[in-house]
């Protein structure tokens, strides 16, 4: 909501999760792994990489089925705490200028830092209009105090807010699982909010920094390396 059409393939780590229709976004973090939101879990997912217009085959797409879909063991569907999911692709993505991985964070998100949020979610704060072309939004990371004041009792240490307290610009339904990137690092995953782009209701995002170890451990545990002794 309140964003702009991204320059074509300018967000090369952005993926669309498809189950017959686009239902969530995600981020490519290595040639065979995608991170998304826990509440985007489905039993079968096709990962679509290199997308810009999701309704048109433009020639740069890679469609790869999920081989493994791993939701965080402490995901809470009621509070959306630990709202993170890992997807192992059935075959590695071909990395090129239009499809490439985003780095995991080396430090937690800092208030005031500019970030890029992207996705194919609803572009209206009232009603619905789902775009075909990838939308981008530049937005600042808010302080934890502002975040907690916006959603009293709902914000855990695994969440942070990004956006504008005045409303008008935000992620929305269909953006879940997608990236929040600051300084070339994946700081957030689109998670939840009360409505979209409402005053004093900024978007809430999963704090990826808290899950770097879980991500690395999960990837290691689900990668088949054959050691010959």
């Amino acid at each position: 909501v309140g964003g702009y059409i991204c320059e074509e393939n300018s967000v090369p780590y952005q993926v669309s999760l498809n189950s017959g229709y686009h239902f969530c976004g995600g981020s490519l973090i290595s040639e065979q792994w995608v991170v998304s939101a826990g509440h985007c879990y489905k039993s079968r997912i096709q990962v679509r990489l290199g997308e810009h217009n999701i309704e048109v085959l433009e020639g740069n797409e890679q469609f790869i089925n999920a081989a493994k879909i791993i939701r965080h063991p402490k995901y809470n569907s009621r509070t959306l705490d630990n709202d993170i999911l890992l997807i192992k692709l059935s075959s590695p993505a071909v990395i090129n200028s239009r499809v490439s991985a985003i780095s995991l964070p080396t430090a937690p998100p800092a208030a005031g830092t500019e970030s890029l949020i992207s996705g194919w979610g609803n572009t209206l704060s009232s009603g619905a209009d789902y775009p075909d072309e990838l939308q981008c939004l530049d937005a600042p990371v808010l302080s934890q105090a502002e975040c907690e004041a916006s959603y009293p009792g709902k914000i855990t240490n695994n969440m942070f807010c990004v956006g504008f307290l005045e409303g008008g610009k935000d992620s929305c339904q269909g953006d879940a699982g997608g990236p929040v990137v600051s300084n070339g690092e994946l700081q957030g995953i689109v998670s939840w909010g009360y409505g979209c782009a409402q005053k004093n209701r900024p978007g809430v995002y999963t704090k990826v920094y808290n899950y770097v170890d879980w991500i690395k451990d999960t990837i290691a545990a689900n990668s088949h390396h054959h050691h010959h002794h």
Epitope: S19, A176, Y194
Partner: antibody, heavy 126, light 106 residues
């Protein structure tokens, strides 16, 4: 409140195309997903597909090669075409509205079909 | 396709009885499960969405539970107006319905 009304020929010849229209009254067709479902006499329900008001579609894989859905927002209508019909396509055809995004999570979620038409019987016979 | 196996296919119970219907998915569908009631000659009516949430205006004697592959639909105290066929429906991938359970009064 929103009401749906299916319309179209009650009799279609084998190998021809079945065409049905659903008219939405009491509310706007815009900003919603809409589905078609069918039910052969005395049998269960089969989902045919859904369409969003932008024209984006999602079809049952078993029927995909024969199904076309379209939407006309100016008339508050959406339509179904099913080609190469046989006697097995004889059924009551329903249109329905898909319920989406109740919660605060930002995925696209469907929560069932909350408004249905009364259904129209289509018989495939020569 | 995800198969939905509903049981029993029919049942007969007395007014005031507790009625339970089960639905099993062929694979994990999380909570992408809805329940409908269909009376003869009528369109289906949504009762429960997201496995356990009661649709607006539906009597509280109807309830649903479950997650993953196994789901349950319950009528806590069967009423004469509950005579109908009940269907489960998944929306994890595309949409499929269970075969239905016909509920009759003894």
């Amino acid at each position: 409140q929103v009401q749906l009304q299916e319309s179209g020929p009650g009799l279609v010849k084998p190998s021809e195309t079945l065409s049905l229209t659903c008219t939405v009254s009491g509310g706007s067709i815009s900003s919603y997903y809409w589905s078609w479902i069918r039910q052969p006499a005395g049998k269960g329900l089969e989902w045919i597909g859904r369409i969003y008001t932008s024209g984006s579609t999602n079809y049952n894989p078993s029927l995909k090669s024969r199904v076309t859905m379209s939407v006309d927002t100016s008339k508050n209508q959406f339509s179904l075409k099913l080609s190469s019909v046989t006697a097995a396509d004889t059924a009551v055809y329903y249109c329905a509205r898909d319920l989406t995004n109740y919660g605060s999570g930002k995925s696209i979620r469907f929560y069932g079909m909350d408004v249905w038409g009364q259904g129209t019987t289509v018989t495939v016979s020569s | 396709d995800i198969q939905m196996t509903q049981s029993p296919s029919s049942l007969s119970a007395s007014v005031g009885d507790r009625v339970t219907i089960t639905c099993q998915a062929s694979q994990d569908i999380s909570n992408y499960l809805n329940w409908y009631q269909q009376k003869p000659g009528k369109a289906p009516k949504l009762l429960i969405y997201d496995a356990s949430n009661l649709e607006t205006g539906v009597p509280s004697r109807f309830s649903g539970s479950g997650s993953g592959t196994d789901f349950t639909f319950t009528i806590s105290s069967l009423q004469p107006e509950d005579i109908a066929t009940y269907y489960c429906q998944q929306d994890d991938n595309f949409i499929t319905f269970g075969g239905g359970t016909k509920v009759e009064i003894k």
